[in-house]
Amino acid sequence: ECVTQLLKDTCFEGGDITTVFTPSAKYCQVVCTYHPRCLLFTFTAESPSEDPTRWFTCVLKDSVTETLPRVNRTAAISGYSFKQCSHQISACNKDIYVDLDMKGINYNSSVAKSAQECQERCTDDVHCHFFTYATRQFPSLEHRNICLLKHTQTGTPTRITKLDKVVSGFSLKSCALSNLACIRDIFPNTVFADSNIDSVMAPDAFVCGRICTHHPGCLFFTFFSQEWPKESQRNLCLLKTSESGLPSTRIKKSKALSGFSLQSCRHSIPVFCHSSFYHDTDFLGEELDIVAAKSHEACQKLCTNAVRCQFFTYTPAQASCNEGKGKCYLKLSSNGSPTKILHGRGGISGYTLRLCKMDNECTTKIKPRIVGGTASVRGEWPWQVTLHTTSPTQRHLCGGSIIGNQWILTAAHCFYGVESPKILRVYSGILNQSEIKEDTSFFGVQEIIIHDQYKMAESGYDIALLKLETTVNYTDSQRPICLPSKGDRNVIYTDCWVTGWGYRKLRDKIQNTLQKAKIPLVTNEECQKRYRGHKITHKMICAGYREGGKDACKGDSGGPLSCKHNEVWHLVGITSWGEGCAQRERPGVYTNVVEYVDWILEKTQAV
């Protein structure tokens, strides 16, 4: 059962796993949610009746029954983790805590103009978990405007104390606001020889990399595969760090793989969700339950639905035994990973999918692409929406993309002459325009947010957000697309598609069926040569065939240029302007979304 509200002046008795320090009960709940075992917590707020050494303590708790006895205690705030909830979860915490000093290892001290600048510095520093900033009113002159970057083993403060005229806050890496590079490559036959901060068991290098990503101190990792010569180290995932933030030594070793934390790209690739099955593999751990199940998929469902289950092993039924049902072993451990991994015993193992909700919805795999043809099929581009105007008569105006459950990203030039959001309708999950009848459900638009530097499409800043009046329930036919990571600026996308209902050739009419075209990206230098009378800025991206014939067309404005990278679709561009409909050999020009990620997040996460 999902319980989101906090219980004031209430303490849960017993079940303690560990104690951490958090600046608020709300953040304590987030820490509990991300902890592999925590189901409940008790936070102690500052209060004259409480011992100051207990202020800001966040006690993480577990219980076999998923609840604990409640005791009245002033200044105690208790609650449940969001593990039990089905809604999207984020570790992003933009709050600034006034007059609080969050203690940790102060590894960097520098002058900053503001707390915001200090927070940005922390976000762009690979080691930084949180910061404390002494304001210009701070009593000690030499400490004024000093920005202290801090880290700890757990990623949370070692203590929090009251201190006048300072502010503290957390790194915004988990808000997708870091400019740090996003290095997705896994290097085969490589060992990073740096200090280990932790080690866990993992079935493959990908899971090892994801574990590294959500471990607060891990910057890179080395994984020993099941063919590694030393038996005791097989399937061992070593979580590593270094002072420079990069591996100091790379050693060539067969059957080892190494890679980097994906913390700078975690909003656009799955890092919590280990969805694969591992055949002929047994995961060992504390046994929670043994249940009969028809298949390993059914076993994974059982594990996902059991809130304390972290991983499972399924042993298929022996012929005609137990109505063809096998045994499903639901398991857990102190850190969420198997205590040992064994091969060759015939089991099929995997992880709970409960943690998938901690990943961005946009990372969910969608149905395979239909190869060839120009007409799309249902569910192929579930983020694509058709934006209609009802004035003077109802018609398709522009395309757009779902980027959040209340947000559509589109082009600013679509709203020329649009006086009010009241005349707009957003239809999602649509394949054919002919499906749209008077009784077809749509989303009303609450607000049109146009970039304040927008003048005309050709000059750039051709980007706008639509805030919907109601939220989108994600389904197979309507779900968000990931924004590109700022750390991905140097990625070369090779699988890009433009979609829309727009004209296919000049003076054509709107298409009934959603059209698609695979188009290659063109360098800005090449694009500039093709548009000699227009400045192609770094905030634009170009795409189109040299031979022409495939390009976005009028009516596709505002729609997505979607590129698949590492199995995840990213909204790389917004159809903006260009020489009409591939009749000339000019690429289409798109708004370069990665350059507007900060703007998008600022507008969509504004309170």
Epitope: M456, R530, R532, H534, G548, E585, R586
Partner: antibody
Framework: QVQLVQSGAEVKKPGASVKVSCKAS????????IEWVGQAPGQGLEWMGV????????NYNENFKDRVTMTAHTSISTAYMELSRLRSDDTAVYFC?????????????WGQGTLVTVSS | DIQMTQSPSSLSASVGDRVTITCKAS??????VAWYQQKPGKAPKLLIY???NRYTGVPSRFSGSGSGTDFTFTISSLQPEDIATYFC?????????FGQGTKLEIK
Amino acid sequence: QVQLVQSGAEVKKPGASVKVSCKASGYAFSNYLIEWVGQAPGQGLEWMGVINPGSGYTNYNENFKDRVTMTAHTSISTAYMELSRLRSDDTAVYFCARTYGKYGGAMDFWGQGTLVTVSS
Amino acid sequence: DIQMTQSPSSLSASVGDRVTITCKASQSVSNDVAWYQQKPGKAPKLLIYYISNRYTGVPSRFSGSGSGTDFTFTISSLQPEDIATYFCQQDYSSPPTFGQGTKLEIK
């Protein structure tokens, strides 16, 4: 109908500057690019640069980059090309032309040309 | 920059003759090729754009063809008023460049 009318012939001394005007009529001036093309006596055509009157963006040929300035006044639908530090080999007819497409392309309307003679 | 090499540089033909001028680009210019006619003391006039599209009001005896790097301009039946210099131009990549011109005379 579309027309581009250029200013009259000029005689200049080496080292001086010349400013040629090109007044457009018969179309939406801001919506099309204006190109400038030079033609030395008995020679071929050489593109000097382009101005986008709508945005004011200019793009110059490397050969002229440090000596040419193109401007446009949309209120009077007039484009200008100024060439500085004139040399005797700048003696040429200078044409303004409108592009056929909004984003570039062939030049469908041309001014009558302005002869600039550089002589000491 | 893309070079446009035009040939011949001059040619003499009789009224009614079929006249062909070729233009070779130093790299592919796709379909972004135009042809102009210039009479002495006048501005060039656009005849053909996108390789083969005749501009408004241009007589049907003028045509263009080709692809990639090789392009041809043809006058199917030469008329006395066609005496002029003809230029090809690529518009594929900035800076746009012109051929050196073909001077057409009547025999």
